[in-house]
């Protein structure tokens, strides 16, 4: 009777347990009753990090110098390339897929002064009644929404990182 589950590092194909391809390689053909799984090493500039049955390896990340990036760790057939910002440049966000010469103000902080050709961004903490939920080199702290002006009530208080949440007034009074 054909198996319904396979062991670790195997997968079920046409009622057979086939071996997965090891990290650094990709699938070229599934196993048969007569032949094992056929795998092929990833090409240069590509990688696969896990045991897999994928027909394509993944492309290494490109650390584009014109996005302010440089290679921190070169990719291998089993690992992706890791990028970091050029000296003096700053990640535009947590993902750090691009960099800017001027720093961003983190959530909870707003821009007090936008960067100029000679000075970096100046950030300030959002005071009570204001918030910033984004990392930005341009945005000031925004005032909390005024629920009253919308005939609503505060359902959830605001913080320096979040706006208040308004909701309908309780009719049962």
């Amino acid at each position: 009777e054909p198996p319904t589950a396979c062991s670790d590092k195997q997968y079920l194909h046409d009622g057979q347990c086939c071996d997965l391809c090891q990290p650094g390689s990709r699938l070229t053909s599934h196993c048969t009753a007569l032949e094992k799984t056929q795998c092929h090493p990833c090409d240069s500039g590509e990688f696969s990090a896990q045991w897999n049955r994928e027909i394509r390896c993944h492309q290494h990340k490109y650390c584009d110098p014109n996005l302010g990036l440089r290679v921190q760790q070169k990719g291998t057939s089993e690992t992706d390339t890791i990028c970091t910002c050029e000296e003096g440049w700053h990640c535009t966000s947590e993902a750090c897929e691009s960099c800017v010469l001027h720093r961003s103000c983190s959530p909870g902080f707003g821009v007090k002064q936008i960067a100029t050709g000679v000075s970096d961004t100046i950030c300030e903490p959002c005071p009570v009644g204001f918030f910033s939920n984004v990392s930005s080199a341009f945005e000031k702290c925004h005032p909390w929404t005024s629920c009253e002006t919308k005939d609503l009530v505060v359902q959830q208080a605001g913080t320096n990182k979040t706006d208040v949440v308004c909701g309908p007034q309780d009719r049962l009074r």
Epitope: H58, Q59, A95, S98, H102, I114, S136, A137
Partner: antibody, heavy 117, light 106 residues
Framework: EVQLQQSGPELVKPGASMKISCKAS????????MNWVKQSHGKNLEWIGL????????TYNQKFKGKATLTVDKSSSTAYMELLSLTSEDSAVYYC??????????WGQGTSVTVSS | QIVLTQSPAIMSSSPGEKVTMTCSAS?????IHWYQQKSGTSPKRWIY???KLASGVPARFSGSGSGTSYSLTINSVEAEDAATYYC?????????FGGGTKLEIK
Amino acid sequence: EVQLQQSGPELVKPGASMKISCKASGYSITGYTMNWVKQSHGKNLEWIGLINTYTGGTTYNQKFKGKATLTVDKSSSTAYMELLSLTSEDSAVYYCAGTGTGAMDYWGQGTSVTVSS
Amino acid sequence: QIVLTQSPAIMSSSPGEKVTMTCSASSSVSYIHWYQQKSGTSPKRWIYDTSKLASGVPARFSGSGSGTSYSLTINSVEAEDAATYYCQQWRTNPYTFGGGTKLEIK
């Protein structure tokens, strides 16, 4: 307020070249990346290339190499894209878009280019 | 190049409904960014780094995903959400966009 103001619509003849400008206001363009994007028939967006406004370094989509040339004038906070040897295939709306938070944060209003004899 | 395939190409929804659109990458990407474009206007950054809402984007929007599969969800759709939404990747040159999902509101 951060804004990107692009030059006006253009009607150009096949074989001609033209230059679109994108002026930043509300911030200094230097140290941010400026992207250029093509939109044909109000449909798909195609990334043309980008310029590092600090170094002047450019990265192009291979498809647009030889078609587009990107430059920047830091003193006027203006980025430019020159389109060469225009054909009807180049008729589209072209956008500049500044990168500041990972994505393309700020977009110009678009410049419509019509190539016709 | 990394091809981003968005589905559906067009979708129709009624106000209050939950809507999900997807963006599938031909090769693994670490993050996806989403843009909203209304007819006759420039695209706007909508969601960046897969799940972070841009400033001014209503909380009914959310983004998620990893690897080759990403999605944008609107919890309770409103008339003002009618637009075309594009996904985009910064992983490898060329930095491609998806073909877009046009959201129509009944």
